[in-house]
Interface confidence: low
Amino acid sequence: FEIALPRESNITVLIKLGTPTLLAKPCYIVISKRHITMLSIKSGERIVFTFSCQSPENHFVIEIQKNIDCMSGPCPFGEVQLQPSTSLLPTLNRTFIWDVKAHKSIGLELQFSIPRLRQIGPGESCPDGVTHSISGRIDATVVRIGTFCSNGTVSRIKMQEGVKMALHLPWFHPRNVSGFSIANRSSIKRLCIIESVFEGEGSATLMSANYPEGFPEDELMTWQFVVPAHLRASVSFLNFNLSNCERKEERVEYYIPGSTTNPEVFKLEDKQPGNMAGNFNLSLQGCDQDAQSPGILRLQFQVLVQHPQNESNKIYVVDLSNERAMSLTIEPRPVKQSRKFVPGCFVCLESRTCSSNLTLTSGSKHKISFLCDDLTRLWMNVEKTISCTDHRYCQRKSYSLQVPSDILHLPVELHDFSWKLLVPKDRLSLVLVPAQKLQQHTHEKPCNTSFSYLVASAIPSQDLYFGSFCPGGSIKQIQVKQNISVTLRTFAPSFQQEASRQGLTVSFIPYFKEEGVFTVTPDTKSKVYLRTPNWDRGLPSLTSVSWNISVPRDQVACLTFFKERSGVVCQTGRAFMIIQEQRTRAEEIFSLDEDVLPKPSFHHHSFWVNISNCSPTSGKQLDLLFSVTLTPRTVDLT
């Protein structure tokens, strides 16, 4: 190899050992029969050398540094050349370094031709191995602006007082151009300005100078984003730290098109703006730090640019001003496992503060919009508490459990609407009366409606789930002893069309001791399946539930149990079932922990089924499934 550097080129070439490898055989630079491990070539020198091994790239690296002095004479602006040409250099991992020194009053601009640059964080590497490391200067201190790969959005970086640019090329890379030019600009009066250009949808992750170490004290850094007017940009902070400020406050400032309050100032911990149309600037301003305990200011953030969906231009008013004790959360559905880039999906309050989830509370009117490629990625969960503190005031009072129409008109699917119904202990109970009779969801007869009501105890210590109920059955009402939650859960987008079928009224009634009472009025020729609460986990200890089953005058009811034995084993107490004719009061009592369950029985009049549990041994729980079928009395039942 021969390397000749022109006089006054201000170029130095250094060949040195790279990261030591565990290769058994050493390798040397051979020059005039001398074996050396480092070679420095300065301006005006010409050196011929070779290597003592076949694969020098496994041992050596080459650094080519060009010093550009803009202090004492004119600055060589324009496209930067790779000197010496890569074709003249040995095939080693090589780093070209340009060190430009200039006056504080002169701005220097690095312009990157396409492909533009993409900033990477600590520990990351570039897929093709080509990296651009850029640093600036504050007096004598070097400040790292960042490390960049190809194929990004960064088109220009402006600095003042000097810039150091290092381009690292792996030995096998064919690149023979620097890919950037230098221009002079007026003073920028800050550490640097980074321009990021989006030509279509995409995202960029950017970092404060010196990241992950601290941003220089009391400095200012600006990012300029060029975004086509038809697209929308959202900013989210991925990671930040605040230092200990003695004077001034660390903050970010935005210049946003169309804003009447430019600059808009945000704390780093604030939600950052979203749904911005067109170009905007973001600046990071440091503070005077506490000398004893400075801490560090650092910021890593992402800008996401995407098409506004039809929805992003629509404002939805959610009027919760007349509601009490209610919260509405719009949030992402649990994601399936996708690792590819997906555009962001945000919900925006007042069109500006956008985040992936948003909770609205009662007592106010809220204006929201969406910035999302696919609104099916979001869903809504609502919680409302209806509580009675004074039993004298609440008794016989009724409330309609209806999803407010404002919520149904939102373009996001409702997942759960939960009503927490609270009553004074041992004073009042509750009765749920549906607009349409309900069916209990069972394996034998599953619900296939677009929504169900999930009814469960709301007493923290009590694990009691009454079941899942949907319209189109035989359950006329459900009475419960104490606090419960009723959750309307939707299963299909068709809920919007079926919303009229929802409708449940809750009334506060005098207290009763049973955990629950189901009033069942079966329809002719349909089999009603009923099961004990807490199916699969067993009816809780010492719990009693009843079914009040109506039999019309011209019908007969067949009661069938689906097991021979209940399977319960009692640790203490007895588990029993009472079947009682309501007209004659005649009753049959079955010991569930001892007797076999009754064979199918026929009832000509309305009757009760009451099941009371003992304290069962673990694993031997009480779960019963039974059915009721009506047939006309004229049929010969023998």
């Epitope: 600590p122 520990g123 994601v335 399936k336 496992q337």
Partner: antibody
């Protein structure tokens, strides 16, 4: 409750194939990713790969590309691991595990299936 | 790929003592690290997710800490049933990797 139940132990000859099944119950299979982990006798855990249960697309760790195939039958809520051209060094316990979240942690595991390859 | 190195390979303690298990990553993985316990003949069990988040049903004596490349699993007072092998797992990027394990044995 959530359960992953794997098929029983297998004794195979070198060069043969084996198909290990993992039946999911107590949750919807397509709501969570399914991962496979190998543990050779007396050794540690090795992540083999995962299958996107929604799309059926598998991803393999480098050491498990080629002879290892991950598949699904959502109609029976079951994930499968098939190994072809078995070698003695494939002798191990193979676990399926359910992945939670975007960057998974494995909250439920199958009981493991011992595959022994011996002539 | 991320290489996880656990230390010590074996830790001998008596019941009631404090156990400190270490896991070091070959590069920064933020908090994408989970801990598992495995007893002989059993499947692994998730103990801690995302370096320090507790798991429902896992005793409070198990805690995790760390971020970046250094992580610690602490058992404040070892119980007889805690003697097992403990693995850390990176979920930072494909391929997900496990540490080689730390065996906690009775002294």
């Amino acid at each position: 409750q959530v359960q992953l139940v794997q098929s029983g132990s297998e004794l195979k000859k070198p060069g043969a194939s084996v198909k290990v099944s993992c039946k999911a119950s107590g949750y919807t299979l397509t709501d969570f990713s399914m991962h496979w982990v190998r543990q050779a006798p007396g050794q540690g855990l090795e992540w083999m790969g995962w299958i996107n249960t929604e799309t059926g697309a598998p991803t393999y760790a480098d050491d498990f590309k080629g002879r290892f195939v991950l598949s699904l039958d959502t109609s029976v809520s079951t994930a499968y691991l098939q190994i072809s051209s078995l070698k003695a060094e494939d002798t191990a316990v193979y676990y399926c595990s359910r992945g939670r979240d975007y960057d998974p942690h494995f909250d439920y595991w199958g009981q493991g299936t011992l595959v022994t390859v011996s002539s | 790929e991320i290489v996880l190195t656990q230390s010590p390979a074996t830790l001998s303690l008596s019941p009631g003592e404090r156990a400190t298990l270490s896991c070091r990553a070959s590069q920064s993985i933020s908090d994408f690290l989970h801990w598992y316990q495995q007893k002989p003949g059993q499947s692994p069990r998730l103990l801690i997710k995302y370096a320090s988040q507790s798991i429902s049903g896992i005793p409070a004596r198990f805690s995790g800490s760390g971020s970046g490349s250094d992580f610690t699993l602490t058992i404040s007072s070892v119980e007889p049933e805690d003697f097992a092998v403990y693995y850390c797992q990176s979920a930072h990027s494909f391929p997900y990797t496990f540490g080689q394990g730390t065996k906690l044995e009775i002294k």
